[in-house]
Interface confidence: low
C-alpha cells in the first residue's frame, strides 16, 4: 500500500496488440501504446501493445534505442496501428530524454507532440476527470 492520497484511474487508450503477450486478443487498453522491435537469437521480434502503468511506459519509452531493441510509444486510440519500430542506423544519435520517433512516419519528439499524439501532464493522467 502507498502512503500518498489514492489516485483515480488514468486515462487509457485503445491500442493494437500483436505478439505473445497479447494471448488471443488483438487489442488492449493502456496509457500509452507501443510498437517494438528486438533482436532475439538473431531473429527480429516485432510486438505491439500497451503500457498500462504510466511509470512503466514512461521508463520504457524514454529508453533510447540500441542495436538490439527499439520501442516507439504514442498516446491516442489505435495510434500504434501504423507504427513499425526500426533499429537505429550507425552514426545516428538518439538522446535518451526523447521518445524515439521516425521522421518519415510523421511522429515527432515528446517535447513537440501535439494534437492526437499530445503527451498529457501528470495531473491530467487520470481516468476520471475532476472539475
Amino acid at each position: 500500500m502507498e502512503d500518498e492520497k489514492p489516485k483515480v484511474n488514468p486515462k487509457l487508450y485503445m491500442c493494437v496488440c500483436e505478439g505473445l503477450s497479447c494471448g488471443n486478443e488483438d487489442h488492449c487498453e493502456g496509457q500509452q501504446c507501443f510498437s517494438s522491435l528486438s533482436i532475439n537469437d538473431g531473429f527480429h521480434v516485432y510486438q505491439k501493445g500497451c503500457f498500462q502503468v504510466y511509470e512503466q511506459g514512461k521508463m520504457t519509452c524514454k529508453t533510447p534505442p540500441s542495436p538490439g531493441q527499439a520501442v516507439e510509444c504514442c498516446q491516442g486510440d489505435w495510434c500504434n496501428r501504423n507504427i513499425t519500430a526500426q533499429l537505429p542506423t550507425k552514426g545516428k544519435s538518439f538522446p535518451g530524454t526523447q521518445n524515439f520517433h521516425l521522421e518519415e512516419q510523421k511522429l515527432i519528439s515528446e517535447e513537440d507532440l501535439g494534437g492526437e499524439q499530445k503527451l498529457i501532464s501528470e495531473e491530467d493522467l487520470h481516468h476520471h476527470h475532476h472539475h
Epitope: 500500500m1 487509457l12 503477450s21 488492449c28 487498453e29 500497451c50 498500462q52 476520471h128 476527470h129
Partner: antibody
C-alpha cells in the same frame, strides 16, 4: 483473453459479513483497475468500488463506510468485504476488469440476505 | 453524476431501427460507455468514448453524443439483440450507470 472467476458465500443472515473473491487469469494484474459491481434482482447496476495492483482504492460514497476491497497480487486475486448486511444487499455481485470501460466480467455471484 | 436513460423499455420488429437515449446530470464530455446485458449473463461492453465500437461488436450498433446528451442506435434490430442496454459514465467518481433499457421483439 482475460478471465475472471469469482466465489464466496451465497446465503447470509442479516448482520453477517459478505465476502467475495475474484481470481484473474490470462491477464497482467497491473494492466487494469479491478472493480466490484452489484445488481439487485431485476434492477440496474451499481458500482461499489475499485482497486489497482498497488492497492489504491476508490469507493462509491454511498457505501464508503462499509465496503472494503483488497488485493493479493501474489495470487492475482482481489476481494470484497461488506459487513453488517441487510436484505437491501441482496444482489448479483460481479467482479470486473476495467480501464475506460468494464471490459471483462466475472460470472456473477448471487448473494441472498435472509433471516 | 446521475445518468437518466429512456425509454425504460421498448418493443420493435426485426429489422427496425432502435434508438436509446442517455442524459447526464452534468457535462461529461464523451466519457460514456454502452453495455448489453442478456438475461442471466454479465454485461458486455459495446461502445466506449460515446461512439467507438469495441472490436468484434457488429457495426449495426453505434453511439453518438457529447456533453450531456447521448444516444445509442441499433440500425437493424436482430433477434439476438434482445437484451437490456445500459449507459455508464467515467467522467468522475463514483462511476454510475443509467437505469437500463430493455429491448424486446414485437410480434
Amino acid at each position: 483473453q482475460v478471465q475472471l472467476q469469482q466465489w464466496g458465500a451465497g446465503l447470509l443472515k442479516p448482520s453477517e459479513t459478505l465476502s467475495l473473491t475474484c481470481a484473474v487469469y490470462n491477464g497482467s494484474f497491473s494492466s487494469y483497475y479491478w472493480s466490484w459491481i452489484r445488481q439487485p434482482p431485476g434492477k440496474g447496476l451499481e458500482w461499489l468500488g475499485e482497486i489497482n495492483h498497488r492497492g489504491r482504492t476508490n469507493y462509491n460514497p454511498s457505501l464508503t463506510s462499509r465496503v472494503t476491497i483488497s488485493v493479493d497480487t501474489s495470487k492475482n486475486q482481489f476481494s470484497l468485504k461488506l459487513p453488517s448486511v441487510t436484505a437491501a444487499d441482496t444482489a448479483i455481485y460481479y467482479c470486473s476488469a476495467h480501464t475506460r470501460g468494464f471490459l471483462y466480467w466475472g460470472q456473477g455471484t448471487l448473494v441472498t440476505v435472509s433471516s | 453524476i446521475q445518468m437518466t436513460q429512456s425509454p425504460s423499455s421498448l418493443s420493435a420488429s426485426v429489422g427496425d431501427r432502435v434508438t436509446i437515449t442517455c442524459q447526464a446530470s452534468q457535462d461529461i464530455n464523451n466519457y460514456l460507455n454502452w453495455y448489453q446485458q442478456k438475461p442471466g449473463k454479465a454485461p458486455k461492453l459495446l461502445i466506449y468514448d460515446a461512439s467507438n465500437l469495441v472490436p468484434g461488436v457488429p457495426s449495426r450498433f453505434s453511439g453518438t453524443g457529447s456533453g450531456t446528451d447521448f444516444s445509442f442506435t441499433i440500425s437493424s434490430l436482430q433477434p439476438e439483440d434482445i437484451a437490456t442496454y445500459y449507459c455508464q459514465h467515467y467522467y468522475d467518481l463514483p462511476l454510475t450507470f443509467g437505469g437500463g433499457t430493455t429491448v424486446a421483439i414485437s410480434r
